[in-house]
Interface confidence: low
């Protein structure tokens, strides 16, 4: 699998030459460049940045760099009617109002076009009513409220703390519970790590800081008005009433200073247990409504944001492959930010920029990769992965025939403790082998490999001496490539110590305080973690594009399929009587997994032995590897989620960020004991087992000898 052999290049131009060209100082410089002004999707500033990146990628040496534009539904606050929440007394007077903006960080006081905190795609409205505190607004939180505490959220405004799950799931859950408005807030328990100062003196969230974000439930649809098809010049757009995934109730985010004012007056039921208490000096009463003296006061939301069809721009760069130009390895990350994007996304965009520069340097010296590499700077990721999804919709026929792999490149860091990787099992061995060749940047691991520090700090829960690699979920631009198109995908970044830091994400996520200085002062002053992430992402792209035989190991898929089958079987076995009554059997699934394991093993043996000098046989074997991920795609998609088509993995129906295995079966089994019609419910479980078993068997057969 030596990378040197791919294009008759000199030994100088191997992976080492590419990696050696990557420089921390350049990443630092690029990050600074990308974070001086806001780059909100749909704005002039972000268009100008797209043109700048296009120009620089051309200078770096890519063969072509084009802008791909789409007209998609975006959402913005009304500049003349700001959004806010008030407490009103019995006369309707506003006796308290939440802040209209975050206090700007030092040095940024004169920056214009900082979008105030808002929940993108919230409908307009001014609901007023009693407040109910719903913890994280997870499915289980509403179960606790409605089933155990008998609290009805219908007609109430709910207040939920950010964290644990994607905010869109919180809003969906609140809607289903009958709420007429949602207030989202950041609790210090989740966004203020003990012993660290708040920004600008540390990396914690100040009381006036607020997390922006979209609240859609798109389920992979892309632009809400053009699901399944690109939002191009001749697109047919749905009416807003038929748009995909829009929330139906007003939603607004606030910081913990404002949350304190709302929560301190709460009355009604006490919190059910300590897991419902945050770190504010308030009782965390659930409500509904305010306590005694304040019982006549209500909460009123004032939301005036508008949804607008707006032009967005992806930048697509191409480095043509010398041997297999019709095979695409894609490195993509988004460019749009909520404000300055110090971490999200520009810590990732700066790494992509340096990877492009390194590849360009090699190309200028006469080298080319074996396969074509596509580089993408996606727009409107923050508004629902729109740029990547529209581009993939426009190019789906090419991608499904030619797409080898997609490597995602959003934020390079969410901490500085150790590596974090989520990827298809096909890439496990690639990641293991690559990290064994890279130096660890971690203190105390000088002279040791990245693999060693990663394994020590984040061990696999199943396999001794190996690092944890997680399932792909969603909430980022790999979604359309993996979940819809079945292109092998992966992502890597540096993360925090999840054992000691239980807060959700990083404290300043999507706030105005996510600046260049946050990264340079507190997270990665030497940019050594950024460099390591560049080496991992870039190294993966290099190997995927340059290895003679694709660096995929199908045996690793066999291992996880067995693990996932065991897990879903054990969930089902929590209902032994029903399984017996309705004749539910997992035999077909376990049989398919067994077949897959045997066929994958035989394929791997053939892969070692075949004549790599025969280009037809080489191409045939590589195509079997490339199309394996594609074989897990069900063209009909998952129930009610047509754009989630991968049968082995999908974003959790309860948390878009998390990946779920055998999602069709999992969702059919979820809360099955509460279904009105158990016969129908268990019938759906059986149907989903059938779909999963068939898909695994069909995928196995793609690895069989072709004749």
């Amino acid at each position: 699998k030596s990378s040197n052999e791919a294009t008759n290049i000199t030994p100088k131009h191997n992976m080492k030459a590419f990696l050696d060209e990557l420089k921390a100082e350049n990443i630092k410089k690029f990050l600074y460049n990308f974070t001086q002004i806001p780059h909100l999707a749909g704005t002039e500033q972000n268009f100008q940045l797209a043109k700048q990146i296009q120009s620089q990628w051309k200078e770096f040496g890519l063969d072509s760099v084009e802008l791909a534009h789409y007209d998609v539904l975006l959402s913005y606050p009304n500049k003349t009617h700001p959004n806010y929440i008030s407490i009103i007394n019995e006369d309707g007077n506003e006796i308290f109002n939440t802040s209209l903006f975050e206090p700007p960080p030092p040095g940024y006081e004169n920056v214009s076009d900082i979008v105030p905190p808002f929940s993108a795609f919230s409908p307009q409205g001014m609901p007023e009513g009693d407040l109910v505190y719903v913890n994280y607004a997870r499915t289980e939180d509403f179960f606790k409220l409605e089933r155990d505490m008998k609290i009805n959220c219908s007609g109430k405004i709910v207040i939920a703390r950010y964290g644990k799950v994607f905010r869109g799931n919180k809003v969906k859950n609140a809607q289903l519970a009958g709420a007429k408005g949602v207030i989202l807030y950041s609790d210090p328990a989740d966004y203020f790590a003990p012993g660290v100062k708040s920004y600008p003196d540390g990396w914690n969230l100040p009381g006036g800081g607020v997390q922006r974000g979209n609240i859609l439930n798109l389920n992979g649809a892309g632009d809400p008005l053009t699901p399944g098809y690109p939002a191009n010049e001749y697109a047919y757009r749905r009416g807003i009433a038929e748009a995909v995934g829009l929330p139906s109730i007003p939603v607004h985010p606030i910081g913990y200073y404002d949350a304190q004012k709302l929560l301190e007056k709460m009355g009604g039921s006490a919190p059910p247990d300590s897991s419902w208490r945050g770190s504010l000096k308030v009782p965390y009463n659930v409500g509904p409504g305010f306590t005694g003296n304040f019982s006549t006061q209500k909460v009123k939301m004032h939301i005036h944001s508008t949804n607008e069809v707006t032009r967005i721009y992806n930048v697509i760069g191409t480095l043509r492959g010398a041997v297999e130009p019709d095979r695409y390895v894609i490195l993509g990350g988004h460019r749009d930010s909520w404000v300055f994007g110090g971490i999200d996304p520009q810590s990732g965009a700066a790494v992509v920029h340096e990877i492009v520069r390194s590849f360009g340097t090699l190309k200028k010296e006469g080298w080319r990769p074996r396969r074509t590499i596509l580089f993408a700077s996606w727009d409107a990721e923050e508004f629902g992965l729109l740029g990547s999804t529209e581009w993939a919709e426009e190019n789906s026929r090419l991608l499904q025939e030619r797409g080898v792999a997609y490597i995602n490149a959003d934020s390079s860091i969410e901490g500085n403790y150790t590596l974090r990787v989520d990827c298809t099992p096909l890439m496990y061995s690639l990641v293991h082998n690559l990290t064994k060749e890279l130096k660890s940047p971690d203190e105390g691991f000088e002279g040791k490999s990245l693999y060693e520090s990663w394994t020590k700090k984040s061990p696999s829960p199943e396999f001794s001496g190996m690092p944890r690699i997680s399932k792909l979920g969603s909430g980022n631009d790999f979604e359309v490539f993996f979940q819809r198109l079945g292109i092998a995908s992966g992502r890597a970044r540096y993360t925090k110590n999840w054992e000691t830091n239980k807060f959700s994400g990083y404290p300043l996520y999507h706030s105005v305080y996510e600046t260049y200085e946050l990264v340079e002062k507190f997270y990665d002053p030497m940019f050594k973690y950024h460099l390591t992430v560049a080496q991992v992402r870039g190294g993966m792209v290099f190997e995927l594009a340059n290895s003679i035989v694709l660096p995929f190991d199908c045996r690793d898929y066999a291992v996880v399929l067995r693990k996932y089958a065991d897990k879903i079987y054990s969930i089902s076995m929590k209902h032994p009587q029903e399984m017996k009554t309705y004749s539910v059997s997992f035999d077909s699934l376990f049989s398919a997994v067994k077949n897959f394991t045997e066929i994958a093993s035989k394929f791997s043996e053939r892969l070692q032995d075949f004549d790599k000098s025969n280009p037809i046989v080489l191409r045939m074997m590589n195509d079997q590897l490339m199309f394996l991920e594609r074989a897990f795609i069900d063209p009909l998609g998952l129930p009610d989620r047509p754009f989630y088509r991968h049968v082995i993995y999908a974003p959790s129906s309860h948390n878009k960020y998390a990946g779920e295995s055998f999602p069709g079966i999992y969702d059919a089994l979820f809360d099955i004991e509460s279904k009105v019609d158990p016969s129908k419910a268990w019938g759906e479980v059986k149907r989903q087992i059938y779909v999963a078993a068939f898909t695994v068997q069909a995928a196995a057969e793609t690895l069989s000898e072709v004749a």
Epitope: K29, Y32, N33, Q36, I37, G42, T43, E44, F47, Q52, S55, H69, G107, N110, V111, S112, E233, T310, R311
Partner: antibody
Framework: EVQLVESGGGLVQPGGSLKLSCAAS????????MNWVRQASGKGLEWVGE??????????HYAESVKGRFTISRDDSKNTAYLQMNSLKTEDTAVYYC???????WGQGTTVTVSS | DIQMTQSPSSVSASVGDRVTITCKAS??????VSWYQQKPGTAPKLLIY???NRFTGVPSRFSGSGSATDFTLTINNLQPEDFATYYC?????????FGQGTKVEIK
């Protein structure tokens, strides 16, 4: 308060040179791209060119009508942008304005007359 | 180059009137259109950016709309200080270009 003050205009013969200055105050000058726009007497507005910030490698872009003759530069330590005009033609006669990125703030303008 | 064609070239109106100025781009410029006001002997001032966003301090009687190729500036309840020349401009691509101007005069 954002302020832009142009200077350096005057009468010059065709083929001659002139250097305009734009002194900025009230904002972090080094972060912003600066444009020059001109307006001939009784006529409309014409964009001349722009210079970006240091983080954009001081990249410049020019209108076709001035390309090769005009050069935009900046000195961030002095909070000043410059427009060096060479090989001037009679049709370059205009009031020259410097503007901050996206033309959201304008100076009061300085008059350049090219005549023999 | 992208041409920005304004109409009408001049309009006579009275205080309290509603005035509408249109600007047509020769090709799609998204929403990257601004509107400027200029009074004799003074520099232009930005009124509207991004086709429909009022710049800081601009009275609410000024509004902008449109996208792609057709854009409109509307002045409701015309005030004495609004008599001036108005320009549209695009910043979608180089070279940035302006319309030829619309003069709003007292009837």
């Amino acid at each position: 308060e954002v302020q832009l003050v142009e200077s350096g205009g005057g009468l010059v013969q065709p083929g001659g040179s002139l250097k305009l200055s734009c002194a900025a105050s009230g904002f972090t000058f080094s972060n912003y791209w600066m444009n020059w726009v001109r307006q001939a007497s009784g006529k409309g507005l014409e964009w001349v060119g722009e210079i970006r910030s240091q983080s954009n490698n001081f990249a410049t872009h020019y209108a076709e009508s001035v390309k090769g003759r005009f050069t935009i530069s900046r000195d961030d330590s002095k909070n000043t942008a410059y427009l060096q005009m060479n090989s001037l033609k009679t049709e370059d006669t205009a009031v020259y304005y410097c503007t901050r990125r996206w033309n959201n703030f304008w100076g009061q303008g300085t008059t350049v007359t090219v005549s023999s | 180059d992208i041409q920005m064609t304004q109409s009408p070239s001049s309009v006579s109106a009275s205080v309290g009137d509603r005035v509408t100025i249109t600007c047509k781009a020769s090709e799609n410029v998204g929403t990257y259109v601004s509107w400027y006001q200029q009074k004799p002997g003074t520099a232009p001032k930005l009124l509207i950016y991004g086709a429909s966003n009022r710049f800081t301090g601009v009275p609410s009687r000024f509004s902008g709309s449109g996208s792609a190729t057709d854009f409109t500036l509307t002045i409701n309840n015309l005030q004495p200080e609004d008599f001036a020349t108005y320009y549209c401009g695009q910043s979608y691509t180089f070279p940035y270009t302006f319309g030829q101007g619309t003069k709003v005069e007292i009837k």
